[in-house]
Every structure is written in structure tokens, then in C-alpha cells.
């Protein structure tokens, strides 16, 4: 039987046994956190479903998610945002260890689709597990990229109070204008409940003494900020080791010189 | 009436071949994920094999197939197959097909009756 | 040997309650979605549970299912002796990308 044709991207097709993964993520997590027992994962399933089947892979829209954000809608308490640009694994070690902060990929939604991919066909009610439109060589307005644009607009606009944010220190540029957090977080903190986004700047050489928050990029991220009327705060987190030992035991008397 | 129903099973020399056919009616096949799961005589059930809903391009095995088993399916002819090489006396079982219900968490919810294999010289 | 392990054997008076135990690792109970089977003599396996702890259309709520952690279990209550079967709980296991039953438990009603 010849299969029938299918439009071939550049990108990786769907993660494999991606409907059964979402919903076991979806089941652990609503088991894990109390507050999100009464979450049905079969309805998540069908919102997050609906957003992608059946549409054409390079025309999806904020408003495609819509449901699906209304099912997993939560809040952050004040002070207990972390975002992250480039630095993903460790902005996730520090938030499994000081457990009353939390990144993106700590809520809902992130927790579901971290590190997925997905996509549809036009006018077909199947997954494609072949290939997926590339942000750059395809389009931009695919299934995943524009699940993230809308999660991580959410995300910084439910933020209040002290907004912390881990920037890569070995990157050419620490703070990336293009990057979801300089696109869309930095644009949708909101300055009425927002005070202050403090920047933790992350060193990747073991002798690097530098202090990168003077690094022109980190510096453009400060005018940025400062003209939406939110004060900037930066941090030198020389070594990311020990600022993670730290945070695991904070009593630890090497811990009372810097990190 | 949700029906899966296996053929293919027999007596074959170890070292041969056997076609395992699983027949599917009252669902829409495409849309699920299937399995193939045995039993060896007096013992429990063992995963075989699965094949991803659709097209079927996400194949897996279990260790002790691999490399001699191939699962495929034929969504318009509503047929599950197991293409069984380089048979071994182990791989002596009653081989069942059954669908994962996504509906159900990916739960077995729909079994066949089973198709008996017997590998011996 | 089955990275899912059940006890081989159960047993029970008509009328008591019996759990069955299905241990693993943070590779397949942890993550992933438990379902459990029961099998009559010389049939085909049934679905019991899914999800853990949900139960299909048509399984009395005498047979519930729970998991904690790296373990789940299901227990029978008010025991029948029709209940005499084999049961396996069965999972994805991301190790060995594939899925994976328990050994299995016969249960006996005495």
C-alpha cells in the first residue's frame, strides 16, 4: 500500500508516543501537586490536541492555545518567578532544590511539552511523527515555537514582585534580544505589579573574575527594563556549582564568602 | 461490535518463519496504537511489540525480538501484522493483539482471542 | 525477569479484601500511566484498571487501583470466587523504550 503523500519539513517529526506522554505528564503532575488535582488530563489532552490537529503546521496562532491555557491556568506567588535564557538545565537544578521557586517548565504546561516536538497535517486528524516545520527554515508560526511564545507570555504576565531571570555568562550575548525571554518575557512583565527583575549572571569558566553584568548586553537588558518602569538588579554567579550547593545547604560555612 | 481477531499461528521449525495477522472491525483502526503481547505456556504475559497510530512509523520491541520480528500495519485492509524470523523453541506462546485506548490512558481495553505458535523440531 | 514485580501468589476468603502489589523504578511506575489486567482461566487478558486508579465501564468497584511513588497496587474487596485469576499490572518503561507487565499474581479464593 503506498503511504499517502505528506508534506515534508526540515524539522524533527513528533516525539514518539507523544499523545500517551502528555497525558502521563499530566497525570504525575496533577498527582504531585495538590493544587492541581482537580485538572481532567483526558480534556488537557483534547485542548492541547485541538491546538495543532487538522491545521496547516505554518499557521498556527496564540489564539490555537487558548483553551488549552484556560485549562492550565495557575499563579506564582510574589518573588517566586525564575526565568531563564539559554541555561535551561540549571535554571531547572535550582528550582528542584529551592522548591518554592519556579521556571516555566515547573508549571503545567511547560512540565508537559518540555523538551517535545509536535505538529499535525492539514485537513488530517493524524500526528506527524516524519517531520516538523524548523523555526528558521520553515516557518516560524509552527505548533511548538508558537506554544512557547504563548505559555511564556503568560507566564511573565502573571509574574509579581522580584522576577528573577539566570542568563548564560559564557554566551556572546548574555542577554539575546531574539531569545523567548528578550522577545517575549522581558515585553509582557507587567511594571504595576512587577518592582524589580534581578539578573543572575552565570559564569562558565572556573577563573573567570569578570564581572559580566557590565557586559554591553546585559546592559541594553537594563535599558530595557528600566524604560518599562521596572528597577534591574544583576548578580555575578561565578561559581554555579557552589551557588547550587549553597542553595542545598545554606549553613555551609564556604558559603557565607561569594558565590 | 469491537472486534480483534489473530491468525497466522502454527508448528514451525526453529530457525523459520510465521506471519501473524491481527483482523480489526467495529473501530477506526488508524487512529490507535496497537500491540502484540504473548504467553508462553504457564507463564505471564510479555510484551512483544507496538506500532504508533496512523502511519505506523514509531516501531518497538522487545529485546528478545529485536532484530527477528518486524510489526506492521496495513490501515486499509484494518490489519495488524507480526512478521516472525528466525523462530526459537522460547518464542513458543499464544500471541495476542490488543489496542491501546487513548480514551483509557493507553490501557489494553480490546484483546483478540490469541493465535498459538509452537516453534519445535 | 520482569522490571514490574508482583508477588507470584495471592489468596483469600470469600468476602475479604486482597491487595496486590506491583513495584518498579522512577523508569516506568514513576513516570508513566499503570493499567492492570485480569486473567481467567483460558481466556484473554481483560483491562481491570487504567490510569492508575481508573476503572472501565462494567469492572464492579469492588477492584480499585492506586499508585505511590515507584509502586502501585490494586486491591479486590468483598472477594468472589470468580475473582480467582491471574493479574498483571503492565506500564511503559523508559529504559527499555517498550512496555513492560509484571509477572503476574495468581490469586486464589479459599
Known amino acids: 500500500v503506498l503511504p499517502r503523500w505528506r508534506q515534508q519539513w526540515s524539522g524533527s517529526g513528533t516525539t514518539s508516543r507523544f499523545p500517551e506522554t502528555v497525558l502521563a505528564r499530566c497525570v504525575k503532575y496533577t498527582e504531585v501537586h495538590p493544587e492541581m488535582r482537580h485538572v481532567d488530563c483526558q480534556s488537557v489532552w483534547d485542548a492541547f490536541k485541538g491546538a495543532f490537529i487538522s491545521k496547516y503546521p505554518c499557521n498556527i496562532t496564540e489564539e490555537d492555545y487558548q483553551p488549552l491555557v484556560k485549562l492550565g491556568t495557575q499563579t506564582v506567588p510574589c518573588n517566586k518567578t525564575l526565568l531563564w535564557s539559554r541555561i535551561k538545565d540549571l535554571a531547572h537544578q535550582f528550582t528542584q532544590v529551592q522548591r518554592d521557586m519556579f521556571t516555566l517548565e515547573d508549571m503545567l504546561l511547560g512540565y508537559l511539552a518540555d523538551d517535545l516536538t509536535w505538529c499535525g497535517e492539514f485537513n488530517t486528524f493524524e500526528i506527524n511523527y516524519q517531520s516538523c516545520p524548523d523555526w528558521r527554515k520553515d516557518c516560524s508560526n509552527n505548533p511548538v515555537s508558537v506554544f512557547w511564545k504563548t505559555v511564556s507570555r503568560r507566564f511573565a504576565e502573571t509574574a509579581c514582585g522580584v522576577v528573577h531571570v539566570m542568563l548564560n555568562g559564557s554566551r556572546s550575548k548574555i542577554f539575546d534580544k531574539n531569545s523567548t525571554f528578550g522577545s517575549v518575557e522581558v515585553h509582557n512583565l507587567q511594571p504595576e505589579k512587577v518592582q524589580a527583575l534581578e539578573a543572575w549572571v552565570i559564569h562558565g569558566g572556573r577563573e573567570d573574575s569578570r564581572d559580566l553584568c557590565q557586559d554591553p548586553t546585559i546592559k541594553e537588558l537594563e535599558s530595557i527594563i528600566s524604560k518599562r518602569n521596572i528597577r534591574f538588579f544583576c548578580k555575578n554567579i561565578y561559581r554555579p556549582d557552589k551557588f547550587l550547593q549553597c542553595v542545598k545547604n545554606p549553613e555551609d560555612s564556604s558559603c557565607l564568602s561569594g558565590i | 461490535e469491537v472486534q480483534l481477531l489473530e491468525s497466522g499461528g502454527g508448528l514451525v521449525q526453529p530457525g523459520g518463519s510465521l506471519r501473524l495477522s491481527c483482523a480489526a472491525s467495529?473501530?477506526?483502526?488508524?487512529?490507535?496504537?496497537m500491540s502484540w503481547v504473548r504467553q508462553a505456556p504457564g507463564k505471564g504475559l510479555e510484551w512483544v511489540s507496538e506500532?504508533?497510530?496512523?502511519?505506523?512509523?514509531?516501531?518497538y520491541y522487545a529485546d528478545s525480538v529485536k532484530g527477528r520480528f518486524i510489526i506492521s500495519r496495513d490501515n486499509s485492509k484494518n490489519t495488524l501484522y507480526l512478521q516472525m524470523n528466525s523462530l526459537r523453541a522460547e518464542d513458543t506462546a499464544v500471541y495476542y493483539c490488543?489496542?491501546?485506548?487513548?480514551?483509557?490512558?493507553?490501557?489494553?481495553?480490546?484483546w483478540g482471542q490469541g493465535t498459538t505458535v509452537t516453534v519445535s523440531s | 525477569q520482569s522490571v514490574l514485580t508482583q508477588p507470584p501468589s495471592a489468596s483469600g476468603t470469600p468476602g475479604q479484601r486482597v491487595t496486590i502489589s506491583c513495584s518498579g523504578s522512577?523508569?516506568?511506575?514513576?513516570?508513566?500511566?499503570v493499567s492492570w489486567y485480569q486473567q481467567l482461566p483460558g481466556t484473554a487478558p481483560k483491562l481491570l484498571i487504567y490510569?492508575?486508579?481508573h476503572r472501565p465501564s462494567g469492572v464492579p468497584d469492588r477492584f480499585s487501583g492506586s499508585k505511590s511513588g515507584t509502586s502501585a497496587s490494586l486491591a479486590i474487596s468483598g472477594l468472589q470466587s470468580e475473582d480467582e485469576a491471574d493479574y498483571y499490572c503492565?506500564?511503559?518503561?523508559?529504559?527499555?523504550?517498550?512496555?513492560?507487565f509484571g509477572g503476574g499474581t495468581k490469586l486464589t479464593v479459599l
Open positions: 490488543a489496542r491501546l485506548e487513548p480514551e483509557k490512558y493507553y490501557g489494553m481495553d480490546v
Open positions: 467495529g473501530f477506526t483502526f488508524d487512529d490507535y496504537v
Open positions: 506500532i504508533s497510530e496512523s502511519d505506523g512509523s514509531n516501531k
Open positions: 522512577n523508569s516506568n511506575i514513576g513516570n508513566n500511566l
Open positions: 490510569r492508575h486508579d
Open positions: 503492565a506500564t511503559w518503561d523508559d529504559s527499555l523504550n517498550g512496555r513492560a
